[in-house]
Structures are given as C-alpha cells and as structure tokens.
Interface confidence: medium
Amino acid sequence: MAHAGRTGYDNREIVMKYIHYKLSQRGYEWDAGDVGAAPPGAAPAPGIFSSQPGHTPHPAASRDPVARTSPLQTPAAPGAAAGPALSPVPPVVHLTLRQAGDDFSRRYRRDFAEMSSQLHLTPFTARGRFATVVEELFRDGVNWGRIVAFFEFGGVMCVESVNREMSPLVDNIALWMTEYLNRHLHTWIQDNGGWDAFVELYGPSMRPLFD
Amino acid sequence: MAKQPSDVSSECDREGRQLQPAERPPQLRPGAPTSLQTEPQGNPEGNHGGEGDSCPHGSPQGPLAPPASPGPFATRSPLFIFMRRSSLLSRSSSGYFSFDTDRSPAPMSCDKSTQTPSPPCQAFNHYLSAMASMRQAEPADMRPEIWIAQELRRIGDEFNAYYARRVFLNNYQAAEDHPRMVILRLLRYIVRLVWRMH
C-alpha cells in the first residue's frame, strides 16, 4: 500500500471519487468542476458561499469524468503554496470506503428515508444545513463509523441536489466535505493510523503482509 | 425511541454501564472542533444526546483533532456535466436509500434577506417548523438538522461498534487458527508505523 507519511492522503481525491461513485449508483455522471481545497493545515481560501443557482447540468462527454479530473490535484489556497505534499490515494482506500458506505446505507436505509423527509434543500439553505449537521455529528467526538456517516450524508445531499435539479450544489458540497476533512478530521485521522487504519478495520479481514 | 437502560444523554462503557464525565473513555472526548460557521469558543461539554442515541459499545478510535480556526468556504465557479444513465438505475443492489419527496422542477427561492417572504415562502417556512416540531420524541423547537445529525451520530456509533467487534473477532479467530499469520500481521503494523515515522 502507498505510504502516506505524516501528511496523509489527498482528502479531495477521496471525496471526489466517493461522490462520483454515489452519483453513478443513481445513474448520474459527474464531471467535477474546480472544487479546489486547501491542503490540511493551510489557510482557507477567501470568499463566501455562493450557490450559483443559475448553473444547469449539460450532457456529459463519453469520457470517464473521474479520469478527466485526475490526478485530482489539490490547488493550494492563497498563502499555502508551500503546503505539504499529499500522497496519491491507493485504490484500496476508495474501494473500502465505497464498501463501507454501501454497507452503511443498506443497514440504515430506513433511518435515511426517515431523515430525508426532514432535509429540505434549497441553494440558499444547503450550506447552513450541511454545516449544522456535520457540526452536531462530530460535536462530542470522532470515530470511523461517524466518518462513514459523514460521507454518506454528503453523498445523500449530492444525490438529492441532482434529483431536485440543483446539480450546481454538488461541487459546493464536495468542497465543504473536503474542507471539513482537512480542517477538522485530518488530525484525528492521522493520529489514528490514517486511512490505512480505516482499510485495516473496514476492509477485507485478511490481506498479505504488504499490499 | 424505546428507552435505553441508561439515560439517552449518558455515555456508556462496553457493558452499557453509565460513565461519569471523569471516567469518559479517552477515545471520545467532548468538544470536537467542528464549527463551520463560527470561531471556536472553547470546548463545551457535549452530550451524547438525541432522540436516537443509545449506548453503542464500540468505542471510537483515538483522540480528537486540536481546534482549527474555521474560515468561510471558498466557492469557485462550478462546472457540471451530468448524464442520466438509465441502465445504471437497476444496477445497484446495495439498497441505497432514496429520497421520495416530490421532485420539484425548480428550487423555491426563499431568501431570508427579504423583509417580507412571499406567501409560498411563508408556507414553506411554516412547513419546515411544523416538521421540526412534529416529532414527539424531541423538544418542539429542535431543528430538523439537529435531529438528522443526532440520528447520524447514533447510527455512526452503532456501525463503528459493529466493525470494532468484527476486527476483534477476526484477530481472535486468526490467533487460534493461524498464529504465524497473526505474527505477520503484527509485523506489518510495526513496519507501517516505523515507515510513517520517517
């Protein structure tokens, strides 16, 4: 498995591929826009939330949207040009997160159906809703199960946005997820073995010594 | 939610015993620096609360990240390419949940900055507050997002406990069946740890 060193993997890549997978499950192809995010520890880019509700999706080209945005480099925010280099994310991390997310959504499908009736998305409420939910979710601690819940919630918001013809929100949600991971979850993840540890816990129970 | 053996806002150890704040498991400390909108204001003691919270017996892994100063989100011009692929609709057998609310053609714009909301917006806002107060198990003023978050926390903790147990059982079983495999596994962890430290 790739060695992430002390800096860890690129959270933006993890988020982008996860959202792409969740949308593709529902029959949508997503070509990510410039969903840049500062590397972990970097100063946030200036600016305020702009939902840009006027944007509409247009037909996809025949290429793989993830391939188009690969290698999904994270643009450094202003003042963060010397940010730490991030390791490329090994495929097993994406795969394990997908499988954990699918297992999670299968187990708790009814809970999510119940929650969905309470989630009233508009371009003007999306950011506040996301912020409030995520803040409360991790208010008293972090664990891998909550991190999977975080990813599934983000995926749900993206699917709901597209379903409700608010697809421009998807790039925003991906950005918020990435920035939350970078600012608030990155240190916990690193302190707890990084995404490699997640793979150990949630991936196949036995693997070769070095993969 | 059916009543739990201990109060819903209590914390539990692996046997479901109520924990006092002093003996809180070190893996789950209060005051996660999670604000997206405001500057950190210390570490308020967070309860484990919510209508759905029970006592998951798997403990989270490790300490919390130190507070980080949250700033506003930067939003760049989004570029979208979406394509409906009907062939994929029946492909997934994962039981992925769906939102079965009505598919409104265009989102209703209810901008809070306008002094007098339009009648549709008034109705929409009334609906939101009605939905928030409909649930019998929470205080009438609980916002839907808070309830959603507490449900996510509940099921996230339950999911975490399931995998924590699964890993324990796998390792236990491996120790019985393949002692050499366990030694190799341990060696692998050590190698990774040393590797990370360089």
């Epitope: 499950q25 159906a113 | 998951p56 949940f97 903790d157």
Partner: antibody, heavy 118, light 113 residues
Framework: QVQLQQPGAELVKPGASVKLSCKAS????????MHWVKQRPGRGLEWIGR????????KSNEKFNNKATLTVDKSSSTAYMQLSSLTSEDSAVYYC???????????WGQGTTLTVSS | DIVMTQSPSSLTVTAGEKVTMSCKSS????????????LTWYQQKPGQPPKLLIY???TRESGVPDRFTGSGSGTDFTLTISNVQAEDLAVYYC?????????FGAGTKLELK
C-alpha cells in the same frame, strides 16, 4: 437450524413491569438485528422496535417510547424487551423476529402471550 | 407514518380457485436507488407466528409454493394465490419495509367455502 424461543405466557398485574425474553440459537446472534412486534386480537401487527445485538443500539416506534426498553445479553444469545407501567392495553402476543439482511423478517419466535390483569 | 390499507378484509373461496388481494400504501415504497419496492407479504395461520412469503414486492421466499405471486410497484400491490389449497387458509399481511416505523396492513383473512 435457526430458532427463537419465547416463553408461552406471562401474567402480570396492572402498573407492574415485565421482561420478555427471546433466546436465539442456530446462528450467530450478533450478526442479525432483532425486532419485536405486538399483536392484539383483531388489531393486526404493530412494530415495536429493533436492537442491534452487537452494539446494543436500538431504533423504536415512537409510540412505544415510554413503554418498551430493548436489551440483549450476548453471552446467552438472548434478546429482552421490558414493558413498564402495564395496562390492559398491553395485553397482547409479543413476537421477536430476526431481520434478514436488513430487509425482512425471516424467522419469528412463537410469541409470548402477555396478560395484564388484577 | 406510512399507512398500509388492505382489501378486502376477508375472502371466501373454493379450493382450486385463483384469488387476489390488494395492499395500498400511503406513500411510495419504491427505492429509486435500486428499483426495489420495499413491501413484504406474510402469512399467519391461527396460533402461529407470521411466516415470510414475499419480499421486495415480488420475490418469493425459498420454500414458498409458486402459486403465491406478488406484484405491483410504488403504492399499489397485489398478492395472488392461484389454485388455492386448504392449507392456504390464513390471514395475509402486507408490510411497509421502506421507512420507519415499519407498519403492517390490517390483514386479509382467507376462508374456505
């Protein structure tokens, strides 16, 4: 083979509490959620709630919020439901049922007939 | 809560006949993510617990005779028993398995003439 064993009957006085049991065998107890269902004569079936035997996490019908407490004892592979402040309305048959793959009840206990009477 | 409405409440049939019973839900039970309808049918004979017949609206549980067929989508569902046998006399319940709280219909009682 999978079996869910429940006591046949319980007789309790109004105002008291009762703890109904459901002993599972023939499968890994912690791998499947256990649900509880109430059936009163002529009233059909009512879902009470479920418990994840692995974590002890529960999800219940709000109607039973102040009535039912679901617990498990993993060492004996037994699920319990405690019913409190009993009234005649609680007189019913209570079933435990295993939820297969989070989608349907594939095995049911024989049910415990609870009679609340002074 | 999702309300499940079954009709008729009782049916009297002759052995060998074909019988259909209806179940309507107050909201759609179709999961658009996997195109499954989360509706389950159970059969309950006197003095016994319910027994699983059909799940996902139309998938027959193993061991259930093929004379039992489930159909429908969204909010309207049907259980059909072709060539009714004496052992089919029971109450049939449909159940919302889409959303919490899980809810059951009031049942359709199948009786022999």
């Amino acid at each position: 083979q999978v079996q869910l064993q429940q006591p046949g009957a319980e007789l309790v006085k109004p105002g008291a509490s009762v703890k109904l049991s459901c002993k599972a065998s023939g499968y890994t107890f912690t791998s499947y959620w256990m649900h509880w269902v109430k059936q009163r004569p002529g009233r059909g079936l009512e879902w009470i709630g479920r418990i994840d035997p692995n974590s002890g996490g529960t999800k219940s019908n709000e109607k039973f919020n102040n009535k039912a407490t679901l617990t498990v004892d993993k060492s004996s592979s037994t699920a319990y439901m405690q019913l409190s402040s009993l009234t005649s309305e609680d007189s019913a048959v209570y079933y435990c049922a295993r939820w297969w793959d989070y989608d349907y009840f594939d095995y049911w206990g024989q049910g415990t007939t609870l009679t609340v009477s002074s | 809560d999702i309300v499940m409405t079954q009709s008729p409440s009782s049916l009297t049939v002759t052995a060998g006949e074909k019988v259909t019973m209806s179940c309507k839900s107050s909201q759609s039970l179709l999961n658009s993510g996997n195109q499954k309808n989360y509706l389950t049918w159970y059969q309950q004979k006197p003095g016994q617990p319910p027994k699983l017949l059909i799940y996902w609206a139309s998938t027959r549980e193993s061991g259930v005779p093929d004379r039992f067929t489930g159909s429908g989508s969204g909010t309207d569902f049907t259980l059909t028993i072709s060539n009714v046998q004496a052992e089919d006399l029971a109450v049939y319940y449909c159940q919302n398995d889409y959303n919490y709280p899980l809810t059951f219909g009031a049942g359709t009682k199948l009786e022999l003439k």
